[in-house]
């Protein structure tokens, strides 16, 4: 069971990143699915290595003082959302903006029907060029 | 099937990074090989988690305006090269240069004879000290 | 065999990071253990994907000129410690400090009784908020 999906620019104002099965994507079988273009949902309980990579372009003067933060979040059936991983990068002083990449990854127990998704502080700063921003998992 | 190879400084002007089976490297068996010191080639079709880490030292004034970009690329038999993953970091203002690390990783389907390699915008900026820059894969 | 442990602030002056089985941690079975809150020790020989993520907050003026470096280290029975992976990030000019995240990961052969741990140049700069700093492994 494995998946690797590719970032998709979205007109939605939500902080949850959007993904698509496009380019050189992976969707090994129907035991993992991309739902509503925003979350990877697994049908089997077990340990999964889950990862995300986010490239963004921001400028210190044009952004809030808070850093750019990417969060990997989990929603299990009958449970509240929770944060699995976060990474933070302070905005660049480069103009018009400076690109930076964040990589998140870890091993987590997922229940049947559990979904994972990626949240960012400012989705408008995310880079969607080939290979820059992606999200995936693999069952151990 | 798994491999982990270590960066090697090169006098070549190519943007493709060079690697070696040295230090604490991994080469599980002959189903994965390091070819010409530049690419990992697999003999078996399947899903692989492929990763690279690149540490570099650059300075904004001494570098081009474009960021430092590391790309994980795929060459399948009878197919054109394609980019699987990219990460970008704007150059530091630290002098003489500021070190930064990039990590790339994702799950991809590889065909028999497929090769993966790592490209960077400026190989002269890459750090080759122990553990700083490495490249590997594992078959799921 | 898999583990994922969560960073713990420590009053110790050591450069070795401290970890805990708290929050959404993983400890698959007793073939991997967290020892003294500082190292993951495995009982079985084999290939492991080992990873660490460290988020830190530093300022160029308040820090030494040297970058912030995170190192993944190995101690095998009867052998000296060795560095498996390192990543470096130059300190930010943001005030009071600028957050940055480092991700390390690679495939390594571990012997029975081998331990892996994470070293940083300045543990006081490490961020311990939910999901920021973690450490884990999985057996292939």
């Amino acid at each position: 069971i494995a998946a690797h999906v590719i970032s998709e620019a979205s007109s939605k104002t939500t902080s949850v990143l959007q993904w698509a099965e496009k380019g050189y994507y992976t969707m090994s079988n129907n035991l993992v699915t991309l739902e509503n273009g925003k979350q990877l949902t697994v049908k089997r309980q077990g340990l999964y290595y889950i990862y995300a990579q986010v490239t963004f372009c921001s400028n210190r003067e044009a952004s809030s003082q808070a850093p750019f933060i990417a969060s990997l979040c989990l929603k299990s059936p009958g449970r509240f959302e929770r944060i699995l991983l976060r990474a933070a990068n302070t905005h660049s002083s480069a103009k018009p903006c400076g690109q930076q990449s964040i990589h998140l990854g870890g091993v987590f127990e997922l229940q049947p029907g559990a979904s994972v998704f990626v949240n960012v502080t400012d989705p408008s700063q995310v880079s969607h060029g080939t290979g820059f921003t992606s999200f995936g998992l693999l069952k151990l | 099937i798994a491999a982990h190879v270590i960066s090697e400084a090169s006098s070549k002007t190519t943007s493709v990074l060079q690697w070696a089976e040295k230090g604490y490297y991994t080469m599980s068996n002959n189903l994965v090989t390091l070819e010409n010191g530049k690419q990992l080639t697999v003999k078996r079709q399947g899903l692989y988690y492929i990763y690279a880490q690149v540490t570099f030292c650059s300075n904004r004034e001494a570098s081009s305006q474009a960021p430092f970009i590391a790309s994980l690329c795929l060459k399948s038999p009878g197919r054109f090269e394609r980019i699987l993953l990219r990460a970008a970091n704007t150059h530091s203002s630290a002098k003489p240069c500021g070190q930064q690390s990039i990590h790339l990783g994702g799950v991809f389907e590889l065909q028999p004879g497929a090769s993966v390699f790592v490209n960077v915008t400026d190989p002269s900026q890459v750090s080759h000290g122990t553990g700083f820059t490495s490249f590997g894969l594992l078959k799921l | 065999i898999a583990a994922h442990v969560i960073s713990e602030a420590s009053s110790k002056t050591t450069s070795v990071l401290q970890w805990a089985e708290k929050g959404y941690y993983t400890m698959s079975n007793n073939l991997v253990t967290l020892e003294n809150g500082k190292q993951l020790t495995v009982k079985r020989q084999g290939l492991y994907y080992i990873y660490a993520q460290v988020t830190f907050c530093s300022n160029r003026e308040a820090s030494s000129q040297a970058p912030f470096i995170a190192s993944l280290c190995l101690k095998s029975p009867g052998r000296f410690e060795r560095i498996l992976l390192r990543a470096a990030n130059t300190h930010s000019s943001a005030k009071p400090c600028g957050q940055q995240s480092i991700h390390l990961g690679g495939v390594f052969e571990l012997q029975p009784g081998a331990s892996v741990f994470v070293n940083v140049t300045d543990p006081s700069q490490v961020s311990h908020g939910t999901g920021f700093t973690s450490f884990g492994l999985l057996k292939l």
């Epitope: 944060i83 | - | 708290k22 908020g129 939910t130």
Partner: nanobody, 116 residues
Framework: EVQLLESGGGLVQPGGSLRLSCAAS????????MMWVRQAPGKGLEWVST????????YYADSVKGRFTIFRDNSKNTLYLQMNSLRAEDTAVYYC?????????WGQGTLVTVSS
């Protein structure tokens, strides 16, 4: 034993504001992400907002984004929810909650009624 005690609810007119508080005990508050959830009359539990242990990251349901603000004071072991521009559809019992490894904990709740 984990204890979460909410307060600050009441009757408020549409467009008004309220600040909810949650006093936590029985665990190391500063180690945990915390959240607010709510249950409208006759409906299921709905997640409202989450804040990380360090207070740096906050997350909101789309229905409250821009109107509600979650914050915490780790020195006082207290979680807050500032609710502005309240609407009739915000009427609910609000619960402070903590994620455990295997299940979630929440308090007794405080009732918020938005009505003219």
């Amino acid at each position: 034993e984990v204890q979460l005690l909410e307060s600050g609810g009441g009757l408020v007119q549409p467009g008004g504001s309220l600040r909810l508080s949650c006093a936590a005990s029985g665990f190391t508050f500063s180690d945990y992400e915390m959240m607010w959830v709510r249950q409208a009359p006759g409906k299921g539990l709905e997640w409202v907002s989450t804040i990380t242990s360090d207070g740096i990251s906050t997350y909101y349901a789309d229905s409250v984004k821009g109107r509600f603000t979650i914050f915490r004071d780790n020195s006082k072991n207290t979680l807050y929810l500032q609710m502005n521009s309240l609407r009739a559809e915000d009427t609910a019992v609000y619960y402070c909650a903590k994620s455990g490894r295997f299940f979630d904990y929440w308090g007794q709740g405080t009732l918020v009624t938005v009505s003219s």
